[in-house]
């Protein structure tokens, strides 16, 4: 039994996610469930460090993208939220919030100027930004 | 084999919009961002913007945005930048190239067009 | 904007010696093990053509004649032994940060 919740202020198009807690979930109430993952879109913003901390609070992380095939519906999102992808100037690599490097052909970095910090944008683009900017955010939470 | 064809040249008169044409072949368009410079006689390259025909996401060189804008029409596998309010400063050759993601980055340009010469002029 | 500054802006070379053309870029454009310079060759009324792809990698057909080297802020490309067929300006583009920023080119003459 599938029911379908429409977003249609975060994504580009209609999206069914599947809700029915038999294939998907825990998450916390009004989360958002999708192939063993649980996602909340925040609406208000804050800088990557409150976005961080803000998402910690609720025993979860910023938005790690690890699969695109597991996380496609991040495919359609609307606009630019934060994410866990922050840039080590010491040794030049792009870390999640877990320690974990960045996978190769996940996300396309796009840097603009001075920034460390990555926001989510459609079609698994990850867009630099200065961490003390305001921004929209994503936490998550893995099922398994 | 891949190519990027461009029109040889548009003249154009001041004050007027042009829309330059890349039309890809040899590949599968959606899967390489498409990227646009200008050269004007007897200097060296500019880079304009690009866009990624899968999404229609773009970036600008911010001396170039309100000046340029870049679309796609993936059915016919065709790019395409408008330059808008032309002046003489606009008078140049301009190219399209095919950007390829190398997995982190859009980090380099390997097919290039013939390039399109826009000569503004009353 | 990351700035590439080439030198030498212009370079007479005597057929088959070694040539070499420096791009400095004002910030570092290496990353995750990467450098995001490339190197192009442009002749006189054609688009410019690939000759090298991060930094040292050599571009599908381009002759062994051409390589590149370098990390971080500085990069060279040499050409060696120089032939006829060089004469040309030569890029490098960065490929790190939007604008995306080419150097202002080196033009390659024969003695």
């Known amino acids: 039994i599938w029911s379908a919740v429409f977003l249609n202020s975060l994504f580009n198009q209609e999206v069914q996610i599947p809700l029915t807690e038999s294939y998907c979930g825990p998450c916390p109430k009004n989360w958002i469930c999708y192939k063993n993952n649980c996602y909340q879109f925040f609406d208000e913003s804050k800088n990557w460090y409150e976005s961080q901390a803000s998402c910690m609070s609720q025993n979860a992380s910023l938005l790690k993208v690890y699969s695109k095939e597991d996380q496609d519906l991040l495919k359609l999102v609307k606009s630019y939220h934060w994410m866990g992808l922050v840039h080590i100037p010491t040794n030049g690599s792009w870390q999640w919030e877990d320690g974990s490097i960045l996978s190769p052909n996940l996300l396309t970095i796009i840097e603009m100027q001075k920034g460390d910090c990555a926001l989510y944008a459609s079609s698994f683009k990850g867009y630099i930004e200065n961490c003390s900017t305001p921004n929209t955010y994503i936490c998550m939470q893995r099922t398994v | 084999q891949v190519q990027l064809q461009q029109p040889g040249a548009e003249l154009v008169k001041p004050g007027a919009s042009v829309k330059l044409s890349c039309k890809a072949s040899g590949y599968t368009f959606t899967t390489y961002w498409i990227q646009w410079i200008k050269q004007r006689p007897g200097q060296g390259l500019e880079w304009i913007g690009e866009i990624d025909p899968s999404d229609i996401f773009t970036n600008y060189n911010q001396k170039f945005k309100g000046k340029a804008t870049l679309t796609v029409d993936t059915s016919s596998s065709t790019a395409y930048m408008q330059l808008s309010s032309l002046t003489s400063e606009d008078s140049a050759v301009y190219y399209c190239?095919?950007?390829?993601?190398?997995?982190?980055?859009?980090?380099?340009?390997?097919?290039w067009g013939t390039g399109t010469t826009v000569t503004v002029s009353s | 904007d990351i700035v590439l500054t080439q030198s030498p802006a212009s370079l007479a070379m005597s057929l088959g010696k070694r040539a070499t053309i420096s791009c400095r870029a004002s910030e570092s454009v290496s990353i995750m093990g990467t450098n995001l310079i490339n190197w192009y060759q442009q002749k006189l009324g054609q688009p410019p053509k690939l000759l090298i792809y991060h930094a040292s990698n050599l571009e599908t057909g381009v002759p062994a004649r051409f390589s590149g080297s370098g990390s971080r802020t500085d990069f060279t490309l040499t050409i060696d032994p120089v032939e006829e067929d060089d004469v040309a300006v030569y890029y490098c583009l960065q490929g790190r940060k939007i604008p995306r920023t080419f150097g202002g080119g080196t033009k390659l003459e024969i003695k």
């Open positions: 190239a095919r950007g390829v993601y190398d997995g982190y980055y859009v980090g380099y340009f390997d097919v």
